[in-house]
Each structure stands twice: as C-alpha cells, then as structure tokens.
Amino acid sequence: ESGYAQNGDLEDAELDDYSFSCYSQLEVNGSQHSLTCAFEDPDVNITNLEFEICGALVEVKCLNFRKLQEIYFIETKKFLLIGKSNICVKVGEKSLTCKKIDLTTIVKPEAPFDLSVVYREGANDFVVTFNTSHLQKKYVKVLMHDVAYRQEKDENKWTHVNLSSTKLTLLQRKLQPAAMYEIKVRSIPDHYFKGFWSEWSPSYYFRTPEINNSSGEMDPI
C-alpha cells in the first residue's frame, strides 16, 4: 500500500476522522422505517465503532444500530418523525461524535421500477412510463422524478427531464433516427419531506425508427 495517503485530504471536504452521513427510508418494509449510516472517510477503522440514535423515538430512549459489513442499519417502527434525533458514533460508552438530525430531512426514496418506453406511430412520439412504491405510502407520497436519457454511444451526454407524474412523452423529432437510447429514472422527496435522490432505476433500452426518405419521417421499427 505504498504511496497511499493515509492522512490525505478527502476529495470534497476536510472531514474529521468520524464524519458520517445517514439516510432514512420511511415505510420501507410495511410500516417499518429504516435508517442507514456510514462513515465518509474510507480509511476509518470501524472495528470497535458503533452507532446509537436517541430522541424523537416512540416508547424507547435510544436504539442501537446493527453493523452490516461497513454500514450501520436500523429497521424499526419507533421513529416519531417529529423533531430531531441525536445520532452518535460510540466506542464502548464514550461518544466520539454526534449529529442532531430530523429524520424527515434525510429521506432517500426507493428507486422507481418497471420503466418502459412505447413508440406511438400515429403521434410520432415515445411514451415513457414507470412505477414507484411511494404511490401506496402514507408518508413520502409526493416525489420529483428525474428521467435521464442518452444515445447509447454518448457516454456522458445525458438529457434530464424533471416531472412529478410517472408518465412522460418524448417527441420523435427531438431524438436521432435509427439510434439506440438508454433511459433511467430516479426520485427525490418533493413535499414536506426532504432528502436525497433515490438510486437509479434499472435502465431501459429502446431504438428509434429509421427516417422514411420519401416523407422525411421516421419508419416504425
């Protein structure tokens, strides 16, 4: 491991040894919520480190996290979801660092799924639809979605469209003819709850029709 900077700077920020970040997922398993935390510094020796959450809990004062490999995880119904909780990194009984966090401000939605694209020949467009488990939830129901698409050959030239519904229409004339496209979607809380983007959905691939030379229009596949 020669040449590896054990005490080098973190790329984005100067962080103390025990800086950590967390996200919550509400009603992720029936009525159970989850909270996941991890250290930001990949060099932290986590062998004897534990996480604990206290405050803004129902029926209990504190809860301990389970360590899953190199993350820390709780699944429970006991989050009050009103006010701030205190999340601490502990070694034995000693707290090394703590953060006061309102769990409703660090919500990471579940990834959208069932993404598909249907070509409408008469309308000369593509209808993009997808699903989200949040339509059935009590808490985090309102999301903003980010649909990203690109021509498969263009490594990093993504076009992004933000929308609040789960349906989007892409005009055929805005896309290249006879090209393979990749499309994916992610979600973020958009009303009352705050937080982070979900993971991306699995990608969906579709091909645009050829141009019909006589009319200048695309042929369906």
Partner: nanobody, 117 residues
C-alpha cells in the same frame, strides 16, 4: 461467490485519459468501502483510491491525487476510476476490490493500463 470484473484499460499516450469500470457481484456492494489497486510488473499491489459506501468520501494515493477520480453506482454494483493526465508511471494492471479485504477474497483478472508514446 465474489466476482469482480474490471474493464476499460488500454494503451494511451502520456497526458491521455481512460475510464476504468468494475462490475461486482456475490456480495452486498453498497455496504462495502471499495478501492482501486494497481500492480506494476515485479511490484506489490498498491492502493490507488478508495470510496465510502455512500460515495461521499474518497481517498487517493499522493501519486494520483488531482488526476484520478473514483466513483461508484450502488444501483448497478459498479465502481469506476476516471484517470486523466496519465503518466508513464501509471502503467500497471488495475484491480478493484474491497478496501478491507476478507481472508477469502480473491482478485479479479484486472485490466491492463499502458502509458507509452
């Protein structure tokens, strides 16, 4: 069974760029600190860059700092290494693996990066 498949290497001139990818399977990728390592002929594995489980913290070897960028996509179990301003000394076989290796962990086949004019 843990599987790590690296790709994206090649022959590049000094000052050029490459983007390495690693497809991981057989373990819970999103729960692990991940790293890129490299091995030059006749040398030990050298730790090049590491990234936290959420991707919000990174570390780099002094020799690559400011030139290489590690990133990850937990939805796709993918690890990446963007390599810019490549130098002759970057020539090596590049491997991805866990930062904290388990006793049973093997290495993938790696991807060869050759910097030559």
């Amino acid at each position: 069974q843990v599987q790590l498949v690296e790709s994206g290497g090649g022959l590049v001139q000094p000052g050029g760029s490459l983007r390495l990818s690693c497809a991981a399977s057989g373990f819970t990728f999103s729960q692990r600190i991940m790293s890129w390592y490299r091995q030059a002929p006749g040398k030990e594995h050298e730790l090049v860059a590491s990234i936290s489980p959420f991707g919000d913290g990174t570390r780099y070897a002094d020799s690559v700092k400011g030139r290489f960028t590690i990133s990850r996509d937990n939805a796709r179990n993918q690890l990446y290494l963007q390599m810019n301003s490549l130098e002759f000394e970057d020539t090596a076989v590049y491997y991805c693996n866990k930062r904290n290796l388990d006793v049973s962990d093997d290495w993938g086949q790696g991807t060869q990066v050759t910097v030559s004019s």
